[in-house]
């Protein structure tokens, strides 16, 4: 059964000996507590109690789920890949059924020669994997195939990928103009049919960082960003110091809640802060402000 | 892979003949194959070829006194060298294409499947 829990407040106490008198749980959210047994964990927000204590799920932490993290880890994949579905059509190479079936030695052979071909067309192309015949049919041997392409994940990949795909079209278009039979002769390791070429598809890997940060950061999802360094996406919060987007609480603590990234101020021995930065000072003795 | 093996190489007088053979391990009925060779120094030549269909050409070098021919049955190539000339020392090696290859009738084909060679020595 789930129970719902008062909201209490917490006095924190900063570095300085100061404290901050915070509501643990924002006034709106509505809280839910996992009770196990004879144990009432207080796991808050989905979090639920393993015996020793709660495990949080994402964006929360604490020892009752109840705080939200200031980063997310969002992982891109380490290489992103395209797959072009290409049609050539091969003159020299006279066409049997025995070309159908993957086992035969027909098909063994065309496939050698084929990839190696291929891998001096695109040997200029360092996101060039290589080549997979996905089906030969008649006419002469029209090649059914896919291009596969690779590289490292940057923000850029999509660039790189769709430029890759370019320099594949002018390639396979080059050398099907130029590797044509002439007087029923062919010198090269393969001859083609000009106007058998073709690009059907090309399907690129679709990562979207943003998009993946906001899903983990669920219903904060308004209030968590990405910023980049060294080219590796970062999921955070305001809260989080040391990006763009970092708030500055001076002399204060961020805390996140569903409204968005706020500040609590500190009180010192010496000083009331105030503001939405906490960055004005109030003297307790003299009352006036310190800007 | 077809493995290509060439033999019948050795050494010979000016005038003389030698039959070189190549044997394959695989089915060269529709095959295109043909014989290179490659002196010392020099790079490698196309000296004889036969197409799929049985057509045969040769290096103008070696017109008139080369024959090329190929035994299906055994699946084995030949290269009849007759009136040897130093100029035709050299290693020769066989080589063929992919089955049901067709348009290869010229000695500058590329194939892919080259076999070791055999050396031939003709002294004067």
């Known amino acids: 059964p789930l129970a719902t829990i008062p909201v209490s407040t917490t006095s924190l106490t900063s570095s300085e000996g100061s404290t901050i008198s915070t509501p643990s749980v924002d006034i709106s959210t509505p809280v839910t507590t996992s009770i196990v047994g004879d144990q009432c964990s207080r796991c808050k927000n989905g979090g639920f109690w393993d015996g020793l204590k709660c495990q949080c799920l994402t964006p929360y932490y604490g020892e009752s789920c109840e705080e939200v993290v200031n980063s997310i880890d969002i992982a891109p994949p380490e290489t992103v890949s395209a797959q072009m579905e290409l049609t050539v059509t091969v003159t020299s190479v006279k066409f049997t059924d025995e070309l159908k079936n993957h086992s035969s030695q027909e098909f063994r052979e065309f496939n050698k020669t084929f990839t190696e071909q291929m891998n001096i067309v695109y040997s200029g192309i360092p996101e060039y994997v290589g080549v997979n015949i996905t089906n030969l049919r008649l006419g002469s041997v029209v090649v059914e195939h896919d291009v596969l392409l690779r590289t490292k994940y940057t923000p850029e990949y999509k660039t790189a990928l769709d430029n890759a795909t370019e320099v594949v079209k002018q390639k396979i278009t080059k050398v099907t103009t130029e590797q044509i039979m002439t007087n029923d002769n062919c010198s090269a390791l393969m001859c083609f049919n000009t106007t058998g070429t073709q690009v059907q598809n090309i399907t690129v890997t679709q990562y979207d960082p943003v998009e993946e940060c906001r899903q983990k950061a669920e219903e904060y999802e308004d209030y968590f960003l990405v910023e980049y360094r060294d080219q590796k996406p970062y999921c955070i919060s305001p809260c989080e110091s040391g990006f763009n987007a970092s708030k500055n609480c001076n002399h204060g603590k961020c805390q996140m809640s569903q409204n968005g990234a706020r500040c609590l101020c500190v009180t010192t021995e010496t000083h009331w802060y105030s503001g939405e930065d906490c960055n004005q000072g109030t003297q307790k003795s003299h009352h006036h402000h310190h800007h | 892979d077809v493995q290509l093996q060439a033999s019948g190489g050795g050494a010979v007088q000016a005038g003389g003949s030698l039959r070189l053979s190549c044997a394959a391990s695989?089915?060269?009925?529709?095959?295109?194959m043909g014989w290179f060779r490659q002196a010392p120094g020099k790079e490698r030549e196309g000296v004889a070829g036969i197409s799929e269909d049985g057509i045969t050409i040769y290096a103008d070098s070696v017109k008139g006194r080369f024959t090329i021919s190929k035994d299906n049955a055994k699946n084995s190539l030949y290269l009849q060298m007759n009136s040897l000339a130093p100029e035709d020392t050299a290693n020769y090696s066989c080589?063929?294409?992919?089955?049901?290859?067709?348009?290869?009738?010229?000695?500058?084909?590329?194939?892919?499947?080259r076999g070791q060679g055999t050396q031939v020595t003709v002294s004067s």
């Open positions: 695989g089915d060269i009925t529709r095959r295109c």
């Open positions: 080589a063929a294409s992919i089955l049901n290859r067709v348009g290869c009738r010229q000695l500058s084909y590329e194939y892919i499947y």
